[in-house]
Amino acid sequence: GDLLIQKTIKKQVVLEEGTIAFKNWVKTGTEVYRQFWIFDVQNPQEVMMNSSNIQVKQRGPYTYRVRFLAKENVTQDAEDNTVSFLQPNGAIFEPSLSVGTEADNFTVLNLAVAAASHIYQNQFVQMILNSLINKSKSSMFQVRTLRELLWGYRDPFLSLVPYPVTTTVGLFYPYNNTADGVYKVFNGKDNISKVAIIDTYKGKRNLSYWESHCDMINGTDAASFPPFVEKSQVLQFFSSDICRSIYAVFESDVNLKGIPVYRFVLPSKAFASPVENPDNYCFCTEKIISKNCTSYGVLDISKCKEGRPVYISLPHFLYASPDVSEPIDGLNPNEEEHRTYLDIEPITGFTLQFAKRLQVNLLVKPSEKIQVLKNLKRNYIVPILWLNETGTIGDEKANMFRSQVTGKIN
């Protein structure tokens, strides 16, 4: 009995035309939503003039439907048992699942000012930037609509910069009509224990963003894992959103619509400083902001973002060191709302429910030459927004899953 089931499972999780896995893999049958909460800055003038703590108030959710597009350029390679593809990006605003509209205004850090002052550290060039910031009537903070902030706007300051720079700025710009990849993953035909594991990303086995083992592309994309998942396993996966591979560990048994699943969570150890978790030494890329690699809970991904000082964390700086959140007022981290989890059906390795949570922050530093930054007395890692990307297997699919998989085993 068990051997027959194993044989059937092994056959059905292979990523090739005709299997259950392939059909759901090419185009997810699950509705995936990305909710955004924007951190609206309440005291922009006090921060700019007196280097006060930044008072933020989260506003959201603003919800988009994502991951509704089928994978593109799906190409099997029989020689090395891989399948390559592009994952197209698309986002559709869902007004009924949102607290407002895409035209809602927010006071946020001026992305261009923060980024340019970080990228161009030459003092003379910073004086030129100062002139252009002033000429364009830009400041340390700006008011932007949700649509602008997420998907892009023409920045008035960057439009004056006399170098060939992209003048459109947005946290997720460009997004619609773009694609992530090329991914090349093992299809599992020759070895089912490798199914969905990434062989290469953008043609490489390494990212070129980090030193040593931190630069490796490990595991799957978290949508599925090789079958017969054990509770003792550490599940590795790669997330292009955070420009790194990360891992999840078993937390608890969960019943999802009558299907027994394993809840795997990203542990606090994954975000720890090298002092606590020596494996993380290569995610510490500089000594000043990280206070000699003792700060934790924020990841500098500037190398992955053309030098822009983007820091990724968990929402509300969950699992981050006190020095990171100290200059920000209005944050309330809690595990239940702000951690990332994956609910995995252990026989197939399919992720049937997930909540991916992350926060996008931008570093802003004092600058003697830039007037709107010269009164700052400290560095700030400024939260801009946090997101919750969720997906849950639909009732119909769950019934089918119960009858075809778990029902047969129990």
């Epitope: 030459n122 003379f124 060039v125 030129i128 100062n130 002139s131 002033n134 000429k135 030459k369 007037q371």
Partner: antibody, heavy 116, light 107 residues
Framework: EVQLQQSGAELVKPGASVKLSCKAS????????MHWVKQRPGQGLEWIGE????????NYNQKFKGKATLTVDKSSSTAYMQLSSLTSEDSAVYYC?????????WGQGTTLTVSS | DIVLTQSQKFMSTSVGDRVSVTCKAS??????VAWYQQKPGQSPKALIY???YRYSGVPDRFTGSGSGTDFTLTISNVQPEDLAEYFC?????????FGGGTKLEIK
């Protein structure tokens, strides 16, 4: 259009002090750092220092510390440079230039002659 | 301080010719170099920034090149109005420094 009107030529005695002015117009005076440059006859250019007119914060070339003092008067959009303990070595043309896309606008210069 | 050396104090050229003015830095300055033109009795005028970018309104016969320690200002199709002294300037580190200048004479 950026315009910089510098004060007229000065003839002063050694040991004295002098205050040169640079009146700016055509732009928001406090928005751009102001630089001062020295040019001795038949010689190259020497950077003296810079001042942020918004808060009068100044930085100097070490060589001119104690010699030059940069100030501004925001109300009249005027930058000043005071030169003290003058010697013949200070005889030169002095230029002011605000930073926009660089040092891309220079005043017409003030000729200072130090002679007894 | 970074020293900028313009080895040729004078250069002679004819209308229509191509001429190259050189500037050598005593240490690496990246591309943080500007070029200025100063006509007799006038203030310096900015021509080039970031070693190779022309300021708006500067004729395209003026071209800047180089990075690190060696920089060149090339004037192709020299015109009579190009009679002037040319200075390089580095802004890689403080104090800002200028080259000694190269006087262009038209034959």
């Amino acid at each position: 259009e950026v315009q910089l009107q510098q004060s007229g030529a000065e003839l002063v005695k050694p040991g004295a002090s002098v205050k040169l002015s640079c009146k700016a117009s055509g732009y928001t005076f406090t928005s751009y750092w102001m630089h001062w440059v020295k040019q001795r006859p038949g010689q190259g250019l020497e950077w003296i220092g810079e001042i942020d007119p918004s808060d009068s914060h100044a930085n100097y070339n070490q060589k001119f510390k104690g010699k030059a003092t940069l100030t501004v008067d925001k109300s009249s959009s005027t930058a000043y440079m005071q030169l003290s303990s003058l010697t013949s070595e200070d005889s030169a043309v002095y230029y002011c230039a605000p930073i926009y896309y660089g040092l891309d606008n220079w005043g017409q210069g003030t000729t200072l002659t130090v002679s007894s | 301080d970074i020293v900028l050396t313009q080895s040729q104090k004078f250069m002679s050229t004819s209308v229509g010719d191509r001429v190259s003015v050189t500037c050598k830095a005593s240490q690496n300055v990246g591309t943080n170099v500007a070029w200025y033109q100063q006509k007799p009795g006038q203030s310096p005028k900015a021509l080039i920034y970031s070693a190779s970018y022309r300021y708006s309104g500067v004729p395209d016969r003026f071209t800047g090149s180089g990075s690190g320690t060696d920089f060149t200002l090339t004037i192709s199709n020299v015109q009579p109005e190009d009679l002037a002294e040319y200075f390089c300037q580095q802004y890689n580190s403080y104090p800002l420094t200028f080259g000694g200048g190269t006087k262009l004479e038209i034959k």
